[in-house]
């Protein structure tokens, strides 16, 4: 039975040209995390595998940095980066957990983080 929950940074905003850290955290389970996939809508951004380490998709290599931890740092943000991001935790023996983050990239300098929230 899957007992874990994914906590994410929730709805966040950031300034155009700046950077942002996408973070998810799996809790309430003793399952082993074997891999975390990061996706932007229908694009694979990066993968962190327990054995193989990080793989960043070549088309995002200039603007995506691994970490901190299992998170992902997006750099040189553009308005086109606005949208949904997903962290997909592959675990054993539980299976797959998915967290969602919505990022809004703002033209103005007023960009505040949203509240943290949990996805069961």
């Amino acid at each position: 039975m899957m007992t874990g929950t994914i906590e994410t940074t929730g709805n966040i905003s950031a300034e155009k040209g700046g950077s942002i850290i996408l973070q998810c955290h799996l809790s309430s389970t003793t399952a082993q995390v074997t891999q975390v996939n990061w996706e932007q809508q229908d694009q694979l951004l990066a993968i962190c595998n327990a054995d193989l380490g990080w793989h960043i998709s070549p088309s995002f290599k200039d603007r995506v940095a691994p970490g901190p931890g299992l998170g992902l740092t997006l750099q040189s943000l553009t308005v086109n980066d606005t949208g949904e991001y997903f962290c997909i935790y592959h675990t054993y023996p539980d299976g797959t957990y998915t967290g969602r983050i919505f990022l809004e990239v703002l033209e103005s300098s007023v960009a505040e983080h949203g509240a943290r929230f949990q996805i069961p």
Partner: antibody, heavy 118, light 107 residues
Framework: EVQLLESGGGLVQPGGSLRLSCAAS????????MHWVRQAPGKGLEWVAS????????YYADSVKGRFTISRDNSKNTLYLQMNSLRAEDTAVYYC???????????WGQGTLVTVSS | DIQMTQSPSSLSASVGDRVTITCRAS??????LNWYQQKPGKAPKLLIY???SLQSGVPSRFSGSGSGTDFTLTISSLQPEDFATYYC?????????FGGGTKVEIK
């Protein structure tokens, strides 16, 4: 240099058994998921089975479930496919392939031919 | 299971031609789509992974695009060594499934 070398194919009667092996070299075998993919004569590619790096998870195509068993010995850098209750439709070239990140198959062996016929 | 439909099943082209092969998934597979080249009597060779990433050592005339359900493999200028059969494959979920293949023949 990454190398995958299959062996164990041959002619077997329907209902018989075979064990295929895939010897891996040139990479840290224990870090990678591994797969078996087959190709019937003149046909396309069909995924058969896969196994995670630590053997924690194994997956099978419906067509072989209950008859084939995938396994690995990380100390010997070897992947196996035990094939039981073989049928004529199992006749194919069997390839082993490396599956980094469980997303793509980047290196393939040369294949070993299994022929099931009476 | 996710069905992968490739088209065309075969095509004839000349050296220097631009060739496009399409692959459609029966449900959204994000960008978990790979392309392979296979020559007679040989093992498949990975060309493109994760829809658009060029595998190391593969010539830049090969490119991939698409996401969701519709994907394309393009060879910008066909070379003599490119005459082969091409397969798409989804890795979104098990069972992994392949398209039926596209045979690229000399016109």
């Amino acid at each position: 240099e990454v190398q995958l070398l299959e062996s164990g194919g041959g002619l077997v009667q329907p209902g018989g058994s075979l064990r295929l092996s895939c010897a891996a070299s040139g990479f840290t075998f224990s870090s990678y998921s591994m797969h078996w993919v087959r190709q019937a004569p003149g046909k396309g590619l069909e995924w058969v089975a896969s196994i995670k790096s630590s053997s924690s998870n194994k997956y099978y195509a419906d067509s072989v479930k209950g008859r084939f068993t995938i396994s690995r010995d990380n100390s010997k850098n070897t992947l196996y496919l035990q094939m039981n209750s073989l049928r004529a439709e199992d006749t194919a070239v069997y390839y082993c392939a490396r599956g980094p990140y469980d997303v793509w198959l980047d290196y393939w062996g040369q294949g070993t031919l299994v022929t099931v016929s009476s | 299971d996710i069905q992968m439909t490739q088209s065309p099943s075969s095509l004839s082209a000349s050296v220097g031609d631009r060739v496009t092969i399409t692959c459609r998934a029966s449900q959204s597979i994000s960008s978990y789509l790979n392309w392979y080249q296979q020559k007679p009597g040989k093992a498949p060779k990975l060309l493109i992974y994760a829809a658009s990433s060029l595998q190391s050592g593969v010539p830049s005339r090969f490119s991939g695009s698409g996401s969701g359900t519709d994907f394309t493999l393009t060879i910008s200028s066909l070379q003599p060594e490119d005459f082969a059969t091409y397969y798409c494959q989804q890795s979104y979920s098990t069972p992994l499934t392949f398209g039926g293949g596209t045979k690229v023949e000399i016109k």
